[in-house]
Interface confidence: low
């Protein structure tokens, strides 16, 4: 790889390896590797291995590290509001006497006007203004499905409040689904959380523009504050560029390890504790794919002559508009290790040890 | 600020400003600022301002950007397992005939052995092995409170599975609470989600080591696979360092704007669209606090003579063990803008425009 001056790849790797030596010791707050004099011979105890494996395994419900932002996320999103169908609409008739829920209906044609194609939708939030309340209540949000079935979307514990408060629920997937289903009226339900053995299932939360018998619930105030969808979407005219050839790549192991990319990319580096660091004290694992980031992130002068060409490069080379962009880790993963302190085996998790992808920042 | 060579702060700011010019245009996919010929005079329409304000306001339930990792998170975490109290214990007697839930109890003294002080706990997960199942079910987790009340913790939609599967729930706050409450038995409940108008409230999910009438539910296998808490904590002997003088600071606006820090820090930079960029086409806001990152991140050779002193610097100056650490943005925030395309006002959200904190990476 060459930038202005040729990069000595071996020196970079050596520096990374030495940095990792210090990083591991510093994370363990050790001034030097622990003595191995008292370590019992033989394999690691089964319980320790089970613990190590528990730590290493990703399981259902554990959130992985945030994914790098997709290319479309770099670009501006047009923001629009779609108010819920007016409460005077006959569609609300059947829902009036249900004490555990309030209902909101939306016209898909209004949504489609703002977001002509489902993939253009970047984020959709349902925003509800809750009126002041002296009670705590656990509430849930559901999406109307075929016939009279409802799909659970999310929940919230609402604590007492002296002032009206806006609530926001992420309904991106739901709105994308609605857009795929053709025009019509789609519904959502805001309900009390009904527990299996609870008697009081009444919704005590009042929502501006829905809850009955509130003064000042007319005209503009009512209109501005009634539930709405806040939509963020890529405008149609901007979307066609996303399929063009000059698109932003994820600078991850999939791309970088199989390409000859000269600019910023994640580079392969396996650390063998014994060979590279001369360490025998880490019993598991024997080594790990540390990797590292390398490659130039050219600073782009926006006063360049080829202005429109230059702008297309921003997304890849200087998305954060830095004065001196730098190739740094984006997605990192932890590393669990097993080592002994005296005769006692320890399983420890070291954060941010494995570089999965890089970015210009 | 000086590194090896003196930094021309004005040049850095100028470069950042010029980079922002390109960034905004590129995010909007504009080759040049839009013409303002057809923009109607007078104020922005009320609806547009309301939309702009909706985009700008943080609301309850919207997740803010991830917080920078606290200092303690840099250091290694010791990992331990605490199995639930054995099912033969009399404490389970009352819970046997409840069809909507299964119950798990834990001994706080076992937890305290692994985590002597509540602040040392970094993460606690409740892990349950669900047996194979042909049904889909929405389930919930509750924490036992005083008397017979239960506090909701989380939920999961479980889809059919052909093989046993581990489920994980983050119970860090709950375990920290248990540690604060003195010794004793603490409980959790895994329940069917009971909706307000649903008739079938039975829990169809079977959990290894709890659900009755399963063969092979004995001895070590049973023991290894029964529900447990996976705890990650800072060891007591390592914890005392966290309160020492050389601690890692959040390189955020609170610290950096009020200090004379020479090393990597976030630096103040307000962009006035009109004055700095010569732009009149952005109607709201008039400008924004873009800020930028600047300052050296010294590479630390771990083969240094003053070894223990060097290790203490890792956390601040090279936590990612980079071969050439770089001062880059850590927490970024979006910027909503209002501008006109012809006579039509548009509200757009630009991602990652405001630098809130920096880090050496």
């Amino acid at each position: 790889l060459s930038t202005c001056k040729t990069i000595d790849m071996e020196l970079v790797k050596r520096k990374r390896i030495e940095a990792i030596r210090g990083q591991i010791l510093s994370k363990l707050r050790l001034a030097s590797p622990p003595s191995q004099g008292e370590v019992p011979p033989g394999p690691l105890p089964e319980a320790v291995l089970a613990l190590y494996n528990s730590t290493r395994d990703r399981v259902a419900g554990e959130s992985a590290d945030p994914e790098p932002e997709p290319e479309a996320d770099y670009y501006a999103k047009e923001v629009t509001r779609v108010l819920m169908v007016d409460r005077n609409n006959a569609i609300y008739e059947k829902t009036k006497d249900i004490s555990h829920s309030i209902y909101m209906f939306f016209n898909t044609s209004d949504i489609r006007e703002a977001v002509p194609e489902p993939p253009l939708l970047s984020r959709a939030e349902l925003r509800l203004q809750r009126l002041k309340s002296s009670v705590e209540q656990h509430v849930e949000l559901y999406q109307k499905y075929s016939n009279n079935s409802w799909r659970y979307l999310g929940n919230r514990l609402l604590t007492p409040t002296d002032t009206p408060e806006w609530l926001s629920f992420d309904v991106t997937g739901v709105v994308r689904q609605w857009l795929n289903q053709g025009d019509g009226i789609q519904g959502a339900r805001f309900s009390a959380h009904c527990s299996c053995d609870s008697k009081d299932n009444k919704l005590h939360v009042e929502i501006n523009g829905i809850s009955p018998k509130r003064r000042g619930d007319l005209g503009t105030i009512h209109d501005m504050n009634r539930p709405f969808l806040l939509l963020m979407a890529t405008p149609l005219e901007r979307a066609q560029h996303l399929h063009s050839s000059r698109h932003r790549r994820a600078l991850d192991t999939n791309y970088c390890f199989s390409s000859t990319e000269k600019n910023c990319c994640v580079r392969q580096l396996y650390i063998d504790f014994r060979k590279d660091l001369g360490w025998k004290w880490i019993h598991e694992p024997k080594g790990y794919h540390a990797n590292f980031c390398l490659g130039p992130c050219p600073y782009i002068w926006s006063l360049d002559t080829q202005y429109s060409k230059v702008l297309a490069l921003y997304n890849q080379h200087n998305p954060g508009a830095s004065a001196s962009p730098c190739c740094v880790p984006q997605a990192l993963e932890p590393l669990p290790i097993v080592y002994y302190v005296g005769r006692k085996p320890k399983v420890e998790q070291l954060s941010n040890m494995i570089v999965r992808s890089c970015k210009c920042s | 600020l000086s590194t090896c060579k003196t930094i021309d702060m004005e040049l850095v700011k100028r470069k950042r400003i010029e980079a922002i010019r390109g960034q905004i245009l590129s995010k909007l996919r504009l080759a040049s600022p839009p013409s303002q010929g057809e923009v109607p005079p007078g104020p922005l329409p009320e609806a547009v301002l309301a939309l702009y304000n909706s985009t700008r306001d943080r609301v309850a339930g919207e997740s803010a950007d991830p917080e920078p990792e606290p200092e303690a998170d840099y250091y290694a975490k010791e990992v331990t397992r605490v199995l639930m109290v054995d099912r033969n214990n009399a404490i389970y007697e009352k819970t046997k005939d409840i069809s909507h839930s299964i119950y798990m109890f834990f001994n706080t003294s076992d937890i305290r052995e692994a985590v002597p002080e509540p602040p040392l706990l970094s993460r606690a997960e409740l892990r349950l092995q669900r047996l194979k199942s042909s049904v889909e079910q929405h389930v919930e987790l509750y924490q036992k409170y005083s008397n017979n009340s239960w506090r909701y913790l989380g939920n999961r939609l479980l889809t059919p599975t052909d093989t046993p599967e581990w489920l994980s729930f983050d119970v860090t706050g709950v375990v920290r609470q248990w540690l604060n409450q003195g010794d004793g038995i603490q409980g959790a409940r895994f329940s069917a989600h009971c909706s307000c108008d649903s008739k079938d409230n039975k829990l169809h999910v079977e959990i290894n080591g709890i659900s009755p009438k399963r063969r092979g539910d004995l001895g070590t296998i049973h023991d290894m696979n029964r529900p447990f808490l996976l705890l990650m904590a800072t060891p007591l002997e390592r914890a005392q360092h966290l309160h020492s003088s050389r601690h890692r600071r959040a390189l955020d606006t609170n610290y950096c704007f009020s200090s004379t820090e020479k090393n990597c820090c976030v630096r103040q930079l307000y962009i006035d669209f009109r004055k700095d960029l010569g732009w009149k086409w952005i109607h709201e806001p008039k400008g924004y606090h873009a800020n930028f990152c600047l300052g050296p991140c010294p590479y630390i050779w771990s083969l240094d003579t003053q070894y223990s002193k060097v290790l203490a610097l890792y956390n601040q100056h090279n936590p990612g063990a980079s071969a050439s650490p770089c001062c880059v943005p850590q927490a970024l925030e979006p910027l909503p803008i209002v501008y006109y395309v012809g006579r039509k006002p548009k509200v757009e959200q630009l991602s990652n425009m405001i630098v809130r904190s920096c880090k050496c990476s």
């Epitope: 005209g219 503009t220 | 005079p41 104020p43 329409p45 609806a47 009149k280």
Partner: antibody, heavy 120, light 112 residues
Framework: EVQLVESGGGLVQPGGSLRLSCAAS????????VHWVRQAPGKGLEWVSH????????YYADAVKGRFTMSRDNGKNTLYLQMNGLKSEDTAVYYC?????????????WGQGTQVTVSS | LPVLTQLSSMSGSPGQTVTITCTGS?????????LSWYQQLPGTAPKLLIY???NRASGVPNRFSGSKSGNLASLTITGLQAEDEADYYC????????????FGGGTKLTVL
């Protein structure tokens, strides 16, 4: 306390010129858009012109476009209306008024007015 | 003719409720632009009563309230008092005119 005080009105012949001033105090003048509004004898209010906070944007009613020029001196906290080519239908009380918030076109403070009479 | 239409005069007795209306179009009131109501007592400068269609300006008694629906704006005065006798003007930005801002023709309110 917010105060707006107009001056410079008087009697002028058709085709003549006048320069009205409006001295502002009690608020940060450079943060607000300001307007001139007039009221002919026995008639309703009529918007005349507007200047933005920084003095960059100026807007005029069709009836005065090309004849009136609005300006401001933020250093002196003063607003001006240069009126040329005056006609008898320009006879009115002229008020200066400040925006409630920057360029909201809602006038939360008004001057007491200055009388302009165009007559031969 | 004014772009915003108001009745030229109205009257009411003390203690009564009166509603003054202002009719516009989609390029002004219906377009969501800021709508204001002003009171002009005889021989004085106008005073802001209501801004943004339904917000009372500071110092304005709560007998005065504003509302808006579609192209129609209303000013309601409850418990009418003698000192409420004045001219009332609505005003709004209009996007269809090069003039920019428009006032209604004004309503002369007489307290009987």
């Amino acid at each position: 306390e917010v105060q707006l005080v107009e001056s410079g009105g008087g009697l002028v012949q058709p085709g003549g010129s006048l320069r009205l001033s409006c001295a502002a105090s009690g608020f940060t003048f450079s943060n607000y858009g300001v307007h001139w509004v007039r009221q002919a004898p026995g008639k309703g209010l009529e918007w005349v012109s507007h200047i933005s906070a920084a003095g960059i944007s100026r807007y005029y009613a069709d009836a005065v476009k090309g004849r009136f020029t609005m300006s401001r001196d933020n250093g002196k906290n003063t607003l001006y209306l240069q009126m040329n080519g005056l006609k008898s239908e320009d006879t009115a009380v002229y008020y200066c008024a400040k925006d409630r918030i920057r360029s909201s076109y809602e006038y939360d403070s008004w001057g007491q007015g200055t009388q302009v009479t165009v007559s031969s | 003719l004014p772009v915003l239409t108001q009745l030229s005069s109205m009257s009411g007795s003390p203690g009564q409720t009166v509603t003054i209306t202002c009719t516009g179009s989609s390029s002004n009131i219906g377009g969501g632009y800021y709508l204001s109501w002003y009171q002009q007592l005889p021989g004085t400068a106008p005073k802001l009563l209501i801004y943004n269609a339904n917000n009372r300006a500071s110092g304005v008694p709560n007998r005065f309230s504003g509302s808006k629906s579609g192209n129609l704006a209303s000013l309601t005065i409850t418990g009418l008092q003698a000192e409420d006798e004045a001219d009332y003007y609505c005003g709004c930005y209009d996007s269809s005119l090069s003039t920019g801002y428009v006032f209604g023709g004004g309503t002369k309110l007489t307290v009987l």
